[in-house]
């Protein structure tokens, strides 16, 4: 069927349009174009005879039309009057005629719009503003933009006059924004320049800063006032109702108690004619005296005595504060404060209660601290420690033992061997010892101030033979790639060499293995599962040697990425599916299966008898090790083909 397509359909004035002919019949004699919806000789634009390739203008020809051999018509330099219908009349060789009609519309290119306003300085919460988009243009659509966004939904915004007018009722300071209007028709769109709305507002209630209202005599008073306002507010200060100055800041140096009072800031907006005020009450305090601490017991005995610390001087209507070790008082049933907080009582003092203690007197302005006081707590002696820690000695060496016990005042020491008093010294020295020097060595510590004494007994063995050693460990179940393990060879013996073996071999050279403490301690850094071996330590001196029983390290690891077997992924319908999952892990991992994301069972093997294509999908094996806190998984896709069909092929 013969049709006409207008390209474009909407045409801007001055541009061109092509009336494109589709489905032109064969064996043509010629054709004519007419303005309008029918063939009218008075409105012929142009005719064309194919045989002669001759174009003949008609009464409606304007000189802007060009006809093409394919019957299409180009109209140039379009004017408004060109809008409408155009009819093509085709004359075939058999003199049978055919007609088709097309159309297009002509629109003007729009000018750049501008915004006019009925109020350039509206007052907040009082005025309305009407913006109008100029010029008024027929067949144009009007749009509005606020801060380059489309209009927000608001009961205070109203469009009228075919959207050409935007009215803002009851303007607020938040309406201070960039406004643009836009005109659109089918062939063009133009945006105006921005118009900034200048809303007059305020002043709001002023704020006075800083907020503190308490000052110490001799300080400077510097107050600043600010109120939100457009145009900016003018400020005035009043003290106790008396005008001071018209500035935003009020400065009074070296204030005294007489400067206490009410301070008013007034903010004024000359355009809105509004005034707002804020009042703050300033109090100036005189300097308080520096406090000091008195104590009822300067040398209290640990776990026996109580101490009462009092903050001096006593001042009426004053808040007393306390600090221990530069911290506020800890919550403790052994700490008690009097009703007025002036006395701090320490019930049943301990050596940790030495302090320092500070008290403070607080006025509304600041806190004055006392000098620190330290308590001399008498304590101890604690159980003495005898060093060195060796218990085995070889004959012929010197025995030198030292005793220490925590005590205040320092302890007095005595040594006993097998219950017999030896000497009153902190150190015991015996040269060239023999087996006869084996025995029980007792250190007694005495505190003369508290009258308390404590003892420690150590068994010393003097022998050429070394005992059988044993291995102690700081971590019996280390986690792979995370933990370190320190093995220590016991006991500690004097003039002894310590040796280590792993799986019956001497220690391999490795940056992860470190010997310390005279080779008595073997540390494995960042253990791996390969470190789960038998460790043996040995001790030797010039006379004897001995080895410990082996200690096997239990390294927690995994779970590693699981493996699903068999590896096959294609099965025939009717077969049994028997999937086994395995992951290296210590302890053994917990297994669970999911088919197409749906949880199944918690077994290592997943068995499904006589599978069908319904069993197609993803089979996931999940492994979990609570000891290492790690998880892992693997997914396998299973395809089940109908019986008699090769996997991957269809009949």
């Amino acid at each position: 069927k013969l049709t006409i397509e207008s390209t474009p359909f909407n045409v801007a004035e001055g541009k061109e349009v092509l009336l494109l002919v589709h489905n032109l019949p064969q064996h043509l004699f010629g054709y004519s174009w007419y303005k309008g919806e029918r063939v009218d000789g008075n409105r012929q634009i142009i005719g064309y005879v194919i045989g002669t390739q001759q174009a003949t203008p008609g009464p409606a020809y304007s000189g802007r039309e060009i006809i093409y051999p394919n019957a299409s018509l180009l109209i140039q330099n379009i004017i408004q009057n060109d809008t409408g219908f155009y009819t093509l009349h085709v004359i075939k060789s058999d003199l049978v005629n055919e007609e088709a009609t097309g159309q297009f519309r002509v629109y003007p290119e729009l000018p750049k719009p501008s915004i006019s306003s009925n109020n350039s300085k509206p007052v907040e919460d009082k005025d309305a503003v009407a913006f109008t988009c100029e010029p008024e243009t027929q067949d144009a659509t009007y749009l509005w933009w606020v801060n380059n966004q489309s209009l927000p939904v608001s009961p205070r915004l109203q469009l009228s006059n075919g959207n050409r007018t935007l009215t803002l009722f009851n303007v607020t300071r938040n309406d201070t924004a960039s406004y643009k209007c836009e005109t659109q028709n089918p062939v063009s769109a133009r945006r105006s320049d921005s118009v900034i709305l200048n809303v007059l507002y305020g002043p709001d209630a002023p704020t006075i800063s800083p907020l503190n209202t308490s000052y110490r005599s001799g300080e400077n008073l510097n107050l600043s006032c600010h109120a939100a306002s457009n145009p900016p507010a003018q400020y005035s200060w009043f003290v106790n109702g008396t005008f001071q100055q018209s500035t935003q800041e009020l400065f009074i140096p070296n204030i005294t108690v007489n400067n206490s009072g009410s301070y008013t800031c007034q903010a004024h907006n000359s355009d809105t004619g509004l005034n707002r005020t804020t009042v703050t009450t300033i109090t100036v305090y005189a300097e308080p005296p520096k406090p000091f601490i008195t104590s009822n017991n300067s040398n209290p005995v640990e776990d026996e005595d109580a101490v009462a610390l009092t903050c001096e001087p006593e001042i009426q209507n004053t808040t007393y504060l306390w600090w221990v070790n530069n911290q506020s008082l800890p919550v403790s049933p052994r700490l008690q404060l009097s009703n007025d907080n002036r006395t701090l009582t320490l019930l049943s003092v301990t050596r940790n209660d030495v302090g320092p203690y500070e008290c403070g007197i607080q006025n509304e302005l600041s806190v004055d601290h006392s000098d620190p006081v330290i308590l001399n707590v008498l304590y101890g002696p604690d159980d003495p420690t005898i060093s060195p820690s060796y218990t085995y000695y070889r004959p012929g060496v010197n025995l030198s033992l030292s005793c220490h016990a925590a005590s205040n005042p320092p302890a007095q020491y005595s040594w006993l061997i097998d219950g017999n008093i030896q000497q009153h010294t902190q150190e015991l020295f015996i040269s060239n010892i023999t087996e006869k020097n084996s025995g029980l060595y007792t250190c007694q510590a005495n505190n003369s101030a508290s009258g308390h004494s404590r003892t420690t007994v150590k068994t010393i063995t003097v022998s050429a033979e070394l005992p059988k050693p044993s291995i102690s460990s700081n971590n019996s179940k280390p986690v792979e790639d995370k933990d370190a393990v320190a093995f220590t060879c016991e006991p500690e013996a004097q003039n002894t060499t310590y040796l280590w073996w792993v799986n019956g071999q001497s220690l391999p050279v490795s940056p992860r293995l470190q010997l310390s403490n005279g080779n008595r301690t073997l540390t494995l850094f960042n253990v791996t599962r390969n470190d789960a071996r038998a460790y043996v330590c040995g001790i030797q001196n010039s006379v004897s040697a001995n080895r410990s029983d082996p200690v096997t390290l239990d390294v927690l690891y995994g779970p590693d990425t699981p493996i699903i077997s068999p590896p096959d992924s294609s099965y025939l319908s009717g077969a049994n599916l028997n999937l086994s999952c395995h992951s290296a892990s210590n302890p053994s991992p917990q297994y669970s299966w999911r088919i197409n994301g749906i949880p199944q069972q918690h077994t290592q093997v997943l068995f499904i008898a006589k599978i069908t294509p319904n069993n197609n999908g993803t089979y996931a094996c999940f492994v979990s090790n609570l000891a290492t806190g790690r998880n892992n998984s693997i997914v396998k896709s299973i395809t089940v083909s109908a019986s008699g069909t090769s996997p991957g092929l269809s009949a």
């Epitope: 917990q590 069972q601 918690h602 077994t603 093997v605 997943l606 609570l626 000891a627």
Partner: antibody
Framework: QVQLVQSGAEVKKPGASVKVSCKAS????????LHWVRQAPGQGLEWIGY????????NYSQKFQGRVTMTRDTSTSTAYMELSSLRSEDTAVYYC?????????????WGQGTLVTVSS | DIQMTQSPSSLSASVGDRVTITCRAS??????LAWYQQKPGKVPKLLIY???NLVEGVPSRFSGSGSGTDFTLTISSLQPEDVATYYC?????????FGQGTKVEIK
């Protein structure tokens, strides 16, 4: 649904042996390990050991080592626990129980229990 | 062997009360701990495994917590049907061992 059905109550003399059976149904017998737990009258639960029905591997508590034997018959999906050299303190309800999964899982399904009384 | 110690051995509480039972392992069992409920004359029933995983079908008023050596079973609002003996059990390798049980009664 999963079910573990145990054999009936037994009365035995000291020194004798007892063999308790546990028939499983409602799941694949070889996929889940079977444990045996006992409970003396008015007492708590005591683990005896387990069997892996797939391989026949057993793991017994040290306390019962040498006296207990766990076996299975995969054709009938039945597990057996035999305790020999019985003494009066072996009087208890003996339970078979299925492990929730394999390795380090608890026991989710339990048999109804078999009362074994050892008395002269 | 790992020893499991439960406390208290028995308790009596009112309907609606929050009830807490604790279980301590003699060594680190990480999170491998289960809780069972055994009603008089019945077989034990698994409530919780891996210290905190609730078994399907068990009421949500039961919850478990803890790791390492210290574990807790909590019944947020005790119901008459919760009268039973509760056992903890470690499932960290063999031998499996149970706590001695906690008997829960209604006041």
């Amino acid at each position: 649904q999963v079910q573990l059905v145990q054999s009936g109550a037994e009365v035995k003399k000291p020194g004798a042996s007892v063999k308790v059976s546990c028939k499983a149904s409602g799941y694949i017998f070889t996929s889940y390990w079977l444990h045996w737990v006992r409970q003396a009258p008015g007492q708590g639960l005591e683990w005896i050991g387990y069997i892996n029905p797939n391989t026949g591997y057993t793991n017994y508590s040290q306390k019962f080592q040498g006296r207990v034997t766990m076996t299975r018959d995969t054709s009938t999906s039945t597990a057996y626990m035999e305790l020999s050299s019985l003494r009066s303190e072996d009087t208890a309800v003996y339970y078979c129980a299925r492990e929730y999964g394999n390795y380090n899982y608890p026991l989710d399904y339990w048999g109804q229990g078999t009362l074994v009384t050892v008395s002269s | 062997d790992i020893q499991m110690t439960q406390s208290p051995s028995s308790l009596s509480a009112s309907v609606g009360d929050r009830v807490t039972i604790t279980c301590r392992a003699s060594e680190n069992i990480y999170g491998y701990l289960a809780w069972y409920q055994q009603k008089p004359g019945k077989v034990p029933k698994l409530l919780i495994y891996n210290a905190k995983n609730l078994v399907e079908g068990v009421p949500s008023r039961f919850s478990g917590s803890g790791s390492g050596t210290d574990f807790t079973l909590t019944i947020s609002s005790l119901q008459p049907e919760d009268v039973a003996t509760y056992y903890c059990q470690h499932h960290y390798g063999t031998p499996y061992t149970f706590g001695q049980g906690t008997k829960v009664e209604i006041k």
